[in-house]
């Protein structure tokens, strides 16, 4: 029995097999910063993690999901001030006793070196240099993301 996320993933993969991709042809919305195939919006105000999650949702986006260390570094390179912390879309799941991304996947322990405890009511923030576990009630800034949608052209035989 596949989860809805897994089903969606399979559908996307099948779609990709039938199409060619031309990524980067669609631009980020105004005021969003392009970072590779994502658009990022860094908040100006502070909020607890739940409110940050909700704000991104109202912007038809999500809290930042970081695929790997390379993406973390590139995101951190956009942050000018060492002292500013930003929520991302990762929090501690008490039931599964693990760090869980808001898309339902679990953190690969090699991806992020987290400073602080993995415990109830802990959420993850990033700074220019580090990744921190913070109380989810802490009011800090946050980063929303939108995925850039590749423009796909159908591949036709002999075209």
């Amino acid at each position: 029995q596949k989860s809805s996320i897994e089903k969606c993933s399979v559908d996307i993969q099948q779609s990709r097999n039938k199409t060619t991709e031309r990524p980067g042809l669609l631009n980020c919305p105004i005021y969003w910063q392009q970072l590779r195939e994502k658009c990022l919006l860094f908040s100006h105000t502070v909020n607890p993690w739940n409110n940050s999650l909700a704000d991104c949702s109202t912007k038809e986006s999500s809290l930042l999901l970081i695929r790997d260390k390379d993406e973390l570094i590139h995101t951190q390179n956009l942050i000018r001030d060492k002292a500013i912390l930003f929520w991302i879309g990762l929090n501690f799941s008490l039931s599964e006793k693990n760090w869980k991304w808001i898309n339902g996947s679990f953190l690969n322990s090699n991806d992020l070196e987290i400073r602080g405890d993995a415990k109830e009511n802990s959420c993850i923030s990033i700074s220019q240099t580090s990744v921190y576990s913070e109380y989810c009630s802490t009011e800090i800034r946050w980063i929303c993301q939108k995925e850039l949608t590749p423009v796909r052209n159908k591949v036709y035989p002999d075209s």
Partner: antibody, heavy 118, light 107 residues
């Protein structure tokens, strides 16, 4: 009371670089977007560009090759450099805070007239 | 770039009367439109953002409407301090662009 104050020379020679600084008080520049806007005498407003508090910039394509905007968080200032100026760059230059997707420039400096003349 | 066209270029109105100012965008800017008031020798002042939301401290006699390409700023009952130049500005696309302004004069 949030205040923005432009400073810099009021007279610049043709082909030289116009340099202005905006000092922000009562609010940190570690938020929002910080823009430069100009207004030639008796004419309308033209957006020059902004610097985002994380350090990225965006410039008006009509001026992009000549513009640099920098941020100095330690002094709570941002600055404008416009190279290779001509008489057409004579204008009142304003610095302003841009609210981004929330919309509009909500705080402005009082403006400084820069004349390009030999 | 998106060209913002304001009309009329000037408007003569008596104090207490209603003034209606128009702004047209060369392509849709959704609701990403702001209005400013500028008096002689002063910086512009933000009146309206999001096409219809009054900025902090702006009197209720100022109202904005419209979306897409057609926008209106209405001053319901002109006061002496309202005689000024009014600019619209779009923030839906780069570069940010302003209209040419409408001068509201005393009749």
């Amino acid at each position: 009371q949030v205040q923005l104050q432009e400073s810099g020379p009021g007279l610049v020679k043709p082909s030289e670089t116009l340099s202005l600084t905006c000092t922000v008080s009562a609010v940190s520049i570690n938020s929002y977007y910080w823009s430069w806007i100009r207004q030639p005498p008796g004419k309308g407003l033209e957006w020059i560009g902004y610097i985002y508090y994380i350090g990225t910039t965006n410039y008006n394509p009509s001026l992009k090759s000549r513009v640099t905007i920098l941020l100095d968080t330690s002094k709570n200032q941002f600055s404008l450099k416009l190279s290779s100026v001509t008489a057409a760059d004579t204008a009142v230059y304003y610095c302003a805070r841009d609210l981004g997707i929330e919309g509009g420039f909500d705080y402005w400096g009082q403006g400084t007239l820069v004349t390009v003349s030999s | 770039e998106i060209v913002m066209t304001q009309s009329p270029a000037s408007l003569s109105v008596s104090p207490g009367e209603r003034a209606t100012l128009s702004c047209r965008a060369s392509q849709s800017v959704s609701s990403s439109l702001a209005w400013y008031q500028q008096k002689v020798g002063q910086a512009p002042r933000l009146l309206i953002s999001g096409a219809s939301t009054r900025a902090t401290g702006i009197p209720a006699r100022f109202s904005g409407s419209g979306s897409g390409t057609e926008f209106t700023l209405t001053i319901s009952s002109l006061q002496s301090e309202d005689f000024a130049v009014y600019y619209c500005q779009q923030y839906n696309n780069w570069p940010l662009t302003f209209g040419g302004g409408t001068k509201v004069e005393i009749k």
